[in-house]
């Protein structure tokens, strides 16, 4: 029977900068029941606080609700593991909520085949940012990525759309049914999950174009 091994805080995520959750990985348990506590202070403060909510994020987690979340302030946190034989501490983790946002996927992805009379046909898609993200304040810049593939293909073709919420693709296989998805990430932060797939049938008379793609 031994003191617990050193835990590690390995992940923190926020859906929208208003709340966030951090997760830790326990070290060895030393063969005894082990209690974990997360303590933190905000940069510039000496007062230590204990995790406000160990439940919401699931096992080995700490959730910070709205009243505990401040932007532009670094949180310095650590996890203490204790059993009857002693204690061990994780390394301190420095967290700035601005940098740990993982948004929901973009919404309302619509995909259409456009066949203008005077130009080559193209695939046109547009989408909306996730609802929880407030882009009007200027605190967020969202970047988008699109992927698509013929229904039976194994490989995805990926395109970076920058900050645009619409995109054109000019080179596709006629007669194929395509799956299209979009995801987003803040300029500092993490990619969202991919949006649900949207299916589009490319007409058999779709003319292949030498130029690959461009965005508005």
């Amino acid at each position: 029977q031994l003191p617990p091994g050193k835990p590690e805080i390995f992940k923190c995520r926020s859906p929208n900068k208003e709340t966030f959750t951090c997760w830790w990985r326990p070290g060895t348990d030393g063969g005894l029941p082990t209690n974990y506590s997360l303590t933190y202070h905000r940069e510039g403060e000496t007062l230590m606080h204990e995790c406000p909510d160990y439940i919401t994020g699931g096992p080995n987690s700490c959730h910070f609700g709205k009243q505990y979340t401040s932007m532009w302030r670094t949180y310095v946190m650590m996890v203490n593991a204790t059993n009857q034989m002693g204690s061990s501490f994780s390394d301190e983790l420095y967290v700035d909520v601005t940098y740990i946002v993982q948004p929901d996927p973009p919404l309302e992805l619509t995909v259409e085949v456009k066949q203008p009379e005077d130009r080559k046909p193209y695939l046109w898609m547009k989408w909306s940012p996730p609802t929880l993200i407030d882009l009007k304040t200027g605190w967020f810049t969202l970047l988008y990525e699109i992927r698509l593939k013929p229904e039976k293909a194994a490989e995805w073709e990926t395109h970076f759309a920058g900050q645009q919420t619409e995109f054109k693709i000019l080179s596709l296989h006629p007669g194929q049914k395509y799956l299209v998805q979009v995801r987003c990430k803040p300029d500092h932060g993490y990619w969202s999950a991919w949006s649900p797939a949207t299916f589009i049938q490319i007409p058999s008379d779709f003319i292949m174009n030498d130029h690959h793609h461009h965005h508005h």
């Epitope: 590690e8 983790l93 420095y94 700035d96 601005t98």
Partner: antibody
Framework: EVQLVQSGAEVKKPGSSVKVSCKAS????????MHWVRQAPGQGLEWIGE????????NYNQKFKDRATLTVDKSTSTAYMELSSLRSEDTAVYYC?????????????WGQGTLVTVSS | DIQMTQSPSSVSASVGDRVTITCKAS??????VAWYQQKPGKSPKLLIY???NRYTGVPSRFSDSGSGTDFTLTISSLQPEDFATYFC?????????FGGGTKVEIK
């Protein structure tokens, strides 16, 4: 204990490429951004770029955008920096440096440095 | 790019002296400044982040004041292990940039 162990010194010809590795241990590799910084002999520090090992998303100093490539191998917790079209001015010690936290780009852990000498 | 201008480029001082190093940013950087110490043949070591926060384990004799464009690193009572080169760094906007360094030498 957090450690960043870099590959050994390299001597390269002008016009060639070099690939420097940085093996991380003592923490979860995908948690923190990894940065590359260089220091020419007797000079200051110059930031080359950064990569998020969780998804390989990277940002570069425009000065190096066309010549530097940052990659990671999550299976071995190793970051790489490749610099192409080498010239004598690229002679420097190249450092990998781990982001200090989940936040802005200050660097709490540094590799021991890899000296790259470019000479004909 | 934001230029970080450090002064002086070198300073001679004795053990126990108070040493100040300044760093001036060419544009507003808020408090997005870090300071590093580097000894010959070694990697830099983080001292201060966010302009005024000492990193874990850094002695209290190191402090920073300033925000916006002007920053000062102060070593309140110089110790033998403090003779080294000091760099400031801004992380307000890409590309992250460093000052040219200040060498603190033994008088």
């Amino acid at each position: 204990e957090v450690q960043l162990v870099q590959s050994g010194a390299e001597v390269k010809k002008p016009g060639s490429s070099v690939k420097v590795s940085c093996k991380a241990s003592g923490y979860t590799f995908t948690t923190y951004w990894m940065h590359w910084v260089r220091q020419a002999p007797g000079q200051g520090l110059e930031w080359i770029g950064e990569i998020d090992p969780s998804d390989s998303y990277s940002n570069y100093n425009q000065k190096f955008k066309d010549r530097a490539t940052l990659t990671v191998d999550k299976s071995t917790s190793t970051a790489y920096m490749e610099l192409s079209s080498l010239r004598s001015e690229d002679t420097a010690v190249y450092y990998c440096a781990r982001n200090g936290g989940l936040g802005p780009a200050w660097f709490s852990y540094w590799g021991q440095g890899t000296l790259v000498t470019v000479s004909s | 790019d934001i230029q970080m201008t450090q002064s002086p480029s070198s300073v001679s001082a004795s053990v126990g002296d108070r040493v100040t190093i300044t760093c001036k940013a060419s544009q507003y950087v808020g408090t997005a400044v870090a300071w590093y110490q580097q000894k010959p043949g070694k990697s830099p070591k983080l001292l201060i982040y966010s302009a005024s926060n000492r990193y874990t384990g850094v002695p209290s004799r190191f402090s920073d004041s300033g925000s916006g464009t002007d920053f000062t690193l102060t070593i309140s009572s110089l110790q033998p292990e403090d003779f080294a080169t000091y760099f400031c760094q801004q992380y307000s906007s890409y590309p992250w940039t460093f000052g040219g360094g200040t060498k603190v030498e033994i008088k």
